[in-house]
């Protein structure tokens, strides 16, 4: 504790200028005071002034009023500081002395004589109010007042409570009259060292180091730290928990980097060809006749479609072609004949039927042959009947379509769910994508089909506490604990309310 006993001398009266021994002062009593403050004694005794003592310079002669003075010699009120817990009781001895010597340091002069003394014993509480008193004896009268106040930074009934206002790393507060702390705006806690975060700042995902701040723990973002950050490698996805990559519409794959609508987004197929969202690049172009190339960007020879009939030979020209017809035929495509049935024009066992009164003919072809003279073996694949990149194969009188994985039907027109074959091992979840199935593996397994057993499964040891859910990340030795409400920490091991310096991603 620490405080000050203050004594204000107001007036001293010694009209006759007499000393305590009955002698008079010559030329007058040049008066100074000695004050002794000590612990309470029922009967005041000589001995050390346990609470302190002080002397004044000469304040006047015989009778005088003592003015207040704040500094220098002759300071009034007199200050008796103490550095202990104020007990609430005291004994005070005030002596008036005459000195023939130095005004400023009368204590040191020889021949000092006592004029009078008073003794006060009693109780006194700490407070700002002065207690006023007056003491008389036969020759003198002294008016005075006194009080006990606490030193700076000390508070309470006995000045025993230390409180120093501060605004730094160790606390942000002012002191109440009783010495208790009064936190500055934005701070809380026993020592006002905990900032009050931005209103609404998420209890688990956010924290602050100064008031009205909301700093997010790893994996969270936004003003209130209530929105997650997708995985580092994520391209076209969002998240509902940190580091997730949930694909936007039209995107697939682990990092949502496979365009499931490549045809719509990029229109890669040229020259009126048909685009399908399939194939190793995410799309396949089916060309119109006369075009080829991955994007149908290459124009074929004009003769490539075999436009000349009846054995005519085709010659490419700049923007067209020309048919050179064999004997007996004419027309742009050698489609007209000068022959009759008498010329036996039908090949491969075709039967000839006369038309236009015998001036022309028509051949009826046996199975597997075609053409106006049954000269062509039927190729049932010329019409590109197989969809979705299926391969057409001639099988005698018929043809079959050999379908790509994931397709079925006579013309490969039906899409099989890739997941129907249950390609994911060890209980993996299958997702149908245009480029094939994608497996989401359970904890402890990895690989394209969840076929690889991970030797170290981060979740296997049950690292998450308090009912938290464990997720393995993209690396087998990384895990995430998703804490239930009321818990925080990398393993959800801390109840909310502990210092918020624990992230929850292990």
């Amino acid at each position: 504790g620490s405080g000050i006993f203050q004594l204000r001398l107001q007036e001293f009266v010694n009209q006759r200028g007499m000393l305590a021994n009955g002698q008079s002062c010559e030329p007058g009593c040049r008066t100074f005071f000695r004050i002794c403050l000590k612990h309470f004694q029922a009967t005041f005794s000589e001995g050390p002034c346990t609470f302190g003592n002080v002397s004044t310079p000469v304040l006047g002669t015989n009778s005088f009023v003592v003015r207040d003075k704040n500094s220098g010699s002759g300071r009034n009120p007199l200050q008796l500081p103490f550095n202990f817990t104020w007990p609430g009781t005291f004994s005070l001895n005030i002596q008036a002395w005459h000195t023939p010597g130095d005004d400023l340091r009368p204590e040191t002069s020889p021949g000092n004589s006592l004029i009078s003394q008073i003794i006060i014993q009693g109780s006194l509480a700490v407070g700002k109010i002065w207690r006023t008193d007056e003491q008389n004896d036969t020759l003198t009268r002294l008016s005075y007042s006194y009080r006990v106040i606490c030193s700076d930074n000390y508070y309470g009934e006995s000045c025993s409570r230390l409180c120093k206002k501060r605004d730094d790393h160790f606390g942000h507060y002012e002191c109440q009259p009783d010495g208790s702390l009064s936190c500055l705006p934005g701070w809380t806690g026993k020592y006002c060292d905990q900032p009050i975060c931005l209103s609404g700042c998420h209890e688990q995902n956010g924290y602050c180091s100064k008031p009205d701040e909301c700093i997010c723990r790893p994996g969270w973002q936004g003003r209130l730290c209530n929105e997650c950050i997708p995985h580092n490698g994520c391209r076209h996805g969002t998240c509902s928990i940190p580091w997730q990559c949930a694909c936007d519409e039209g995107w697939g794959g682990l990092f949502c980097d496979q365009d499931l609508n490549y045809c719509t987004h990029h229109s890669p197929c040229k020259n009126g060809s048909t685009c399908s969202n399939s194939g190793p690049k995410g799309y396949t172009c089916t060309c119109l006749p006369g075009y080829t190339g991955e994007h149908c960007e290459l124009g074929l020879s004009k003769c490539a479609s075999n436009p000349c009939r009846n054995g005519g030979s085709c010659k490419d020209q700049e923007n067209s072609y020309h048919c050179l017809c064999p004997p007996g035929y004419y027309g742009q495509h050698c489609e007209h004949s000068t022959l009759t049935c008498a010329d036996s024009p039908c090949f491969n066992g075709g039967s000839c039927r006369e038309r236009n009164q015998g001036s022309s003919y028509a051949c009826e072809c046996p199975p597997n042959f075609t053409g106006s003279n049954c000269e062509k073996k039927v190729d049932r694949c010329t019409s590109n009947p197989c969809a979705n990149g299926g391969q057409c194969q001639n099988r005698g009188p018929s043809r079959t379509c050999r379908c790509r994985p994931g397709f079925t039907g006579t013309h490969c027109e039906l899409h099989i769910s890739d997941c129907a074959r249950s390609p994911c091992a060890h209980g993996g979840t299958c997702h149908d994508l245009e480029n094939g199935p994608v497996c989401t593996c359970p904890a402890g397994f990895s690989g394209r089909r969840c076929e690889v057993r991970i030797t170290h499964d981060a979740c296997a040891s049950g690292p998450c506490f308090n009912g938290a859910t464990c997720y393995t990340g993209l690396s087998p030795n990384n895990f995430v604990c998703n804490c239930p409400y009321g818990f925080v920490g990398s393993r959800c091991e801390f109840p909310v309310g502990l210092p918020p310096s624990f992230p929850w991603v292990a």
């Epitope: 790893p218 936004g222 994520c234 076209h236 990384n478």
Partner: antibody, heavy 118, light 107 residues
Framework: EVQLVESGGGLVQPGGSLRLSCAAS????????MAWVRQAPGKGLEWVAT????????YYRDSVKGRFTISRDNAKNSLYLQMNSLRAEDTAVYYC???????????WGQGTLVTVSS | DIQMTQSPSSLSASVGDRVTITCRAS??????LAWYQQKPGKSPKLLIF???NLADGVPSRFSGSGSGTDSTLTISSLQPEDFATYFC?????????FGQGTKLEIK
């Protein structure tokens, strides 16, 4: 392919201003928080500012607070850094990066040089 | 702010060598640490995140380990293209801070 292309750097006098831009492609820009990171010549990397993807919350390193402003335009797939009251110590290559202050910076632009000198 | 101290600041090695770079944080960063590679005149490239996770497209000769305040980047068999400067970065505490860098040179 993720691409971040910065522009707007150059020579400016102390006290002057510059506006850096970053054009993003190859990912859904509006889904991701973005940042600016700088590197003084021959020195290490220093985070400058961050903006969230959701509500546009911004954070700055103490030495640029009140002078720099980070912003984004999701419709244009663009990130910006308005730099005012430039000082000699702001001289650096400024990189646009995908990430927040509490996540790794997964993708970086090629950088744009800002020189503050009289 | 958390201080990140890398060691060594530079080192010389030969193709095929095994190389280790360490990074020490001034306080626990709970595995929230990344490693970047930067070649002269180029931008940094993310190699490793969360102390030990390999970023997409990074060769498996790179690996990370550590916990608490100490982390390590290891290159199991140096290739000619690995000579560069490497930086560590913590993203556990605000603001994020980087190490001063380690320059890996050809011996």
């Amino acid at each position: 392919e993720v691409q971040l292309v910065e522009s707007g750097g150059g020579l400016v006098q102390p006290g002057g201003s510059l506006r850096l831009s970053c054009a993003a492609s190859g990912f859904t820009f509006s889904n991701f928080p973005m940042a600016w990171v700088r590197q003084a010549p021959g020195k290490g990397l220093e985070w400058v500012a961050t903006i969230s993807s959701s509500d546009g919350t911004t954070y700055y390193r103490d030495s640029v607070k009140g002078r720099f402003t980070i912003s984004r335009d999701n419709a244009k797939n663009s990130l910006y850094l308005q730099m005012n009251s430039l000082r000699a110590e702001d001289t650096a290559v400024y990189y646009c990066a995908r990430g927040y202050y509490n996540s790794p910076f997964a993708y970086w632009g090629q950088g744009t040089l800002v020189t503050v000198s009289s | 702010d958390i201080q990140m101290t890398q060691s060594p600041s530079s080192l010389s090695a030969s193709v095929g060598d095994r190389v280790t770079i360490t990074c020490r944080a001034s306080e626990d960063i709970y595995s929230n640490l990344a490693w970047y590679q930067q070649k002269p005149g180029k931008s940094p490239k993310l190699l490793i995140f969360d102390t030990n996770n390999l970023a997409d497209g990074v060769p498996s000769r790179f690996s990370g380990s550590g916990s608490g305040t100490d982390s390590t980047l290891t290159i199991s068999s140096l290739q000619p293209e690995d000579f560069a400067t490497y930086f560590c970065q913590q993203y556990n505490n605000y603001p994020p801070t980087f190490g001063q860098g380690t320059k890996l040179e050809i011996k």
